[in-house]
Interface confidence: low
């Protein structure tokens, strides 16, 4: 028996359902009683879901997995993973045994988009050209870790005094805080771009300082 899976990682958004595709080619006269199907975590070999002795043995993984029972006889051994979490990310092995056996691994990449950045300025009043200011760009609840870029009003990169921290919350999603310390010109726009490298999602925030008032 030959097992086939997608070579590309399956990308799933947090809180949505994902399908890990796996298929085999059943011989004529194939019966589900002949099938032993096991999904397991590739690295730890932890059992995720199984179908043996002609019946679905159910989820061994947080009760969030399911097979496609009506499609098994056609050779569809795909696994549905519900309400995807950050901790579900990784490699899953589909193991099929009929008379002989084969297995293949499929990768699950979890992602969550970042929120539109909020911008804060310190100090935020009585600003003059030449003052040193701290601009903070905050974006929330994304995954995986973001790439953060700062640019000036001409779109040129600001790479100088930048400190970026990323903290994971209890769900494994990241909150990003990036701080730019800059000496004010006569006026200027400072833009922060938070990029999710998996989703190719860019979230933009900017602050324009033109004396008073500031615009965000």
């Amino acid at each position: 028996v030959e097992v086939q899976v997608s070579e590309d990682p399956v990308v799933a958004l947090v809180d949505t359902d994902a399908t890990l595709r796996c298929s085999f080619s059943p011989e004529p006269g194939f019966s589900l009683r002949q099938l032993n199907l096991i999904w397991q975590l590739t690295d730890t070999k932890q059992l995720v879901h199984s179908f043996t002795e002609g019946r679905d043995q159910g989820s061994a993984y947080a009760n969030r997995t399911a097979l496609f029972p009506d499609l098994l006889v056609q050779g569809n051994a795909s696994l549905r993973l519900q309400r995807v979490r950050v901790t579900d990310e990784g490699s899953y092995t589909c193991f099929v045994s009929i008379q002989d056996f084969d297995s293949a691994a499929v990768s699950l990449q979890v992602a969550a988009p970042y929120s539109k950045p909020s911008m804060t300025l310190e100090p935020n009043k009585d600003l003059r050209p030449g003052d040193m200011v701290t601009i903070t760009c905050s974006s929330y609840q994304g995954y995986p870790e973001a790439e953060v870029f700062w640019k000036d009003g001409q779109g040129l990169p600001l790479t100088g005094n930048v400190t970026t921290s990323q903290m994971a919350n209890e769900r494994g999603l990241f909150d990003v805080h990036s701080v730019l310390r800059v000496v004010l010109g006569a006026n200027g726009t400072y833009s922060c771009l938070v990029r999710n490298p998996v989703l190719q999602q860019d979230a933009h925030g900017s602050v324009t300082i033109t004396g008073q008032p500031m615009t965000f």
């Epitope: 590309d8 399956v10 990308v11 958004l13 359902d17 309400r83 988009p113 989703l199 190719q200 999602q201």
Partner: antibody
């Protein structure tokens, strides 16, 4: 059986407002992103916006940003598209669709026609 | 924004023909590209997702592939029910864009 049913379309004057609804059934609404996609008469598909039903994540096409607002009510299994400052070029059939995996929408509603005309 | 340029805009073919439709992305994109079939007065139907994965219940005569920024939908042997309009769609940077569509007509 998964179903999405749009409602709320109709004839509205330029500058007017309309709220579309997308009633979902047959799946766990709170775990799926929902999209709105539109199709002008005789034209192609144009993506409008998406939302996670928690309301935490939303995203809009540039053409509707600032005029349209997408929202969801998980207690009613319904997504909404509030359309303000409507223009003639917003005339289209509006579909809601369920997000399947990144880059795809697997179930679509039947669509509701919005006509913006004086 | 990333543009998806779809070609041809229309084609005539006969039952049993092999049909190929291409979408070219204006810049580098991930494999998050989907293909849909739409018939007049109906909602689109998902055929292919992640560039090459066949959606559940879709006949195996449909396939998708990728080469760089070019994405291709192939119908290996056109059937009467396949005469329709086909759209590609990408989702880079959370902004979704569709190709202009390809109408497949009976020769």
């Amino acid at each position: 059986e998964v179903q999405l049913v749009e409602s709320g379309g109709g004839l509205v004057q330029p500058g007017g407002s309309l709220r579309l609804s997308c009633a979902a059934s047959g799946f766990t609404f709170s775990t799926y992103y929902i999209h709105w996609v539109r199709q002008a008469p005789g034209k192609g598909l144009e993506w409008v916006a998406w939302i996670h039903p928690s309301g935490k994540y939303t995203y809009y096409a540039d053409s509707v940003k600032g005029r349209f607002t997408i929202s969801a009510d998980t207690s009613k299994n319904t997504a909404y598209l509030q359309m303000n400052s409507l223009r003639a070029e917003d005339t289209a059939v509006y579909y809601c669709a369920r997000h399947y995996q990144v880059g795809a929408m697997d179930y679509w509603g039947q669509g509701t026609l919005v006509t913006v005309s004086s | 924004d990333i543009q998806m340029t779809q070609s041809p805009s229309s084609l005539s073919a006969s039952v049993g023909d092999r049909v190929t439709i291409t979408c070219r992305a204006s810049q580098s994109v991930s494999s998050a590209v989907a293909w849909y079939q739409q018939k007049p007065g109906k909602a689109p139907k998902l055929l292919i997702y992640s560039a090459s994965s066949l959606y559940s219940g879709v006949p195996s005569r449909f396939s998708g592939s990728r080469s760089g920024t070019d994405f291709t939908l192939t119908i290996s042997s056109l059937q009467p029910e396949d005469f329709a309009t086909y759209y590609c769609q990408q989702s880079g940077r959370s902004l979704y864009t569709f190709g202009q569509g390809t109408k497949v007509e009976i020769k």
